[in-house]
């Protein structure tokens, strides 16, 4: 409906169909088109003080087409509407109005929000996240061996990002402390993170280990491991289970 206007020809013969051009079925020298060929719309074009009939393949912007058996007419959309299918069904509002269900509104109704890009009232979209993925293996400084207490992480994906007024997304990362059976590292066994890491000189009594990058989700500084008798170890294991800490990243 936003199409170009039909061209009006200069020479028109009074009421003689075969002399009409530009889509006219009948025309006159003074009034231009009087009727149009099928599937064309009749519209009045003002030229100075005079109104001339023209036949258009579609109605100009701000007008809509109505069909009648004898003529198809272009009629103006409502004042607040730029393009429409009819007076009750706007498809694009004038500046400063928001489109909702074919109507142009100053403000969006309750439960909807204004999209200032499309100038529409849209449903408030809340964040949607997937189920948690399984916990990662228990690691410490990228290794799954050579320690007793480490951290494990799990993630979930954002399925639906929220709109401006929507609920924010809950955390998508979660890290907690974990306990593993002490396992000696095999010769040359490396961290699971398959990425080159900066190395630092080991402290006295420390084995040379890869340092996790600053983004590592370790929840707290690791307590240096001390030698404990079997009873103390058991006791600590129970306490650790109860003390499972979660650290979350909010998006």
């Amino acid at each position: 409906q936003n199409a170009s206007r039909g061209r009006r020809q200069r020479r028109m013969h009074p009421n003689v169909s075969q002399g009409c051009q530009g889509g006219c079925a009948t025309c006159s020298d003074y009034n231009g088109c009087l009727s149009c060929k099928p599937r064309l719309f009749f519209a009045l074009e003002r030229i100075g003080m005079k109104q001339i009939g023209v036949c258009l393949s579609s109605c100009p912007s701000g007008y809509y087409g109505t069909r009648y058996p004898d003529i198809n007419k272009c009629t103006k959309c409502k004042a607040d509407c730029d393009t429409c299918f009819n007076k009750n069904f706007c498809t694009k509002c004038k500046s400063g109005f928001y489109l909702h269900l074919g109507k142009c509104l100053d403000n969006c109704p309750e439960g909807l929000e204004a999209n200032n890009h499309t100038m529409e009232c849209v449903s408030i979209v809340h964040c949607e996240v997937s189920e948690w993925n399984p916990w990662s293996p228990c690691t410490k400084k990228g290794k799954t061996c050579g320690f007793k207490r480490g951290t494990e992480t799990r993630v979930r994906e954002i399925i639906q990002h929220p709109s401006a007024k929507g609920n924010l997304c809950p955390p998508t990362n979660e890290t907690r402390k974990c306990t593993v059976q002490r396992k000696k590292c095999q010769k040359g066994e490396r961290g699971k993170k398959g990425r080159e890491r900066k190395r630092k000189k080991p402290n006295k009594g420390e084995s040379k280990e890869a340092i996790p990058d600053s983004k590592s989700l370790e929840s707290s500084k690791e307590i240096p491991e001390q030698r404990e008798n079997k009873q103390q170890q058991k006791k600590r294991k129970v306490q650790d289970k109860q003390k499972s800490v979660s650290v979350s990243t909010v998006h």
Epitope: S57, G65, R67, Y68, F85, N86, K87, N88, K92
Partner: antibody, heavy 117, light 111 residues
């Protein structure tokens, strides 16, 4: 004469997306809006939305708003309707139609979409 | 949304007789003196075909045995005399408001 020719049948899994095309001929493509309507097996007709080929402006039935995208390629006089996050209830015949002065006067032959796991 | 209720859901008519299908809208589909109601015919495996536009106007190429009437919320499609090729499902459709809606359809069978 006016003709709307649609792409062939599609079989998709739940969660996937589908893009149906509608090639127009026999008239000036930018003159009329193109609408999409669907019909589930043995059911009635349901309006999905429209697009103006002249400027790409589109509007959708609220029911489909977050899942449907309509586009046009005026150089090929073709309209497209993409439906995402498919579910079994989307199994239907999808029609494109020209909208002339508030009625659907020409229709495509329909594209059958089957959504099944 | 404007709900269109068609009745009957199906009807069987003898050749040469009259078939009358009703369509009631949940709110008026009239505006500025125009009725935004259309009627379509659909045969199995085919797309719908426009019969009547603006409540009472016959689409070009459609036989004169089809006629439409009504305004506001009550509309009727008449087929008289019914011919064999008229066996199909008929739908009313309103264009007055967003979203555009269709009736559930009326299946016409021949006795």
């Amino acid at each position: 004469q006016v003709q709307l020719v649609q792409s062939g049948a599609e079989v998709k899994k739940p969660g996937a997306s589908v893009k149906v095309s509608c090639k127009a001929s026999g008239y000036t493509f930018t003159d009329y809006s193109i609408h999409w309507v669907r019909q589930a097996p043995g059911q009635g007709l349901e309006w999905i939305g429209y697009i103006y080929p002249s400027n790409g402006d589109s509007g959708y039935n609220q029911k489909f708003k977050n899942r449907v995208t309509m586009t046009v390629d005026t150089s090929y006089s073709t309209a497209y309707m993409e439906l995402s996050r498919l579910r079994s209830e989307d199994t239907a015949v999808y029609y494109c139609a020209t909208y002339f002065a508030n009625n659907f006067d020409y229709w495509g032959q329909g594209t059958t979409l089957t959504v099944s796991s | 949304d404007i709900v269109l209720t068609q009745s009957p859901a199906s009807l069987a008519v003898s050749l040469g007789q009259r078939a009358t299908i009703s369509c009631k809208a949940s709110q008026s589909v009239d505006y500025d003196g125009d009725s935004y109601m259309n009627w379509y015919q659909q045969k199995p495996g085919q797309p719908p075909k426009l019969l009547i536009y603006a409540a009472s106007n016959l689409e070009s190429g459609i036989p004169a045995r089809f006629s439409g009437s009504g305004s506001g919320t009550d509309f009727t499609l008449n087929i008289h005399p019914v011919e064999e090729e008229d066996a199909a499902t008929y739908y009313c459709q309103q264009s007055n408001e967003d979203p555009l809606t269709f009736g559930a359809g009326t299946k016409l069978e021949l006795k």
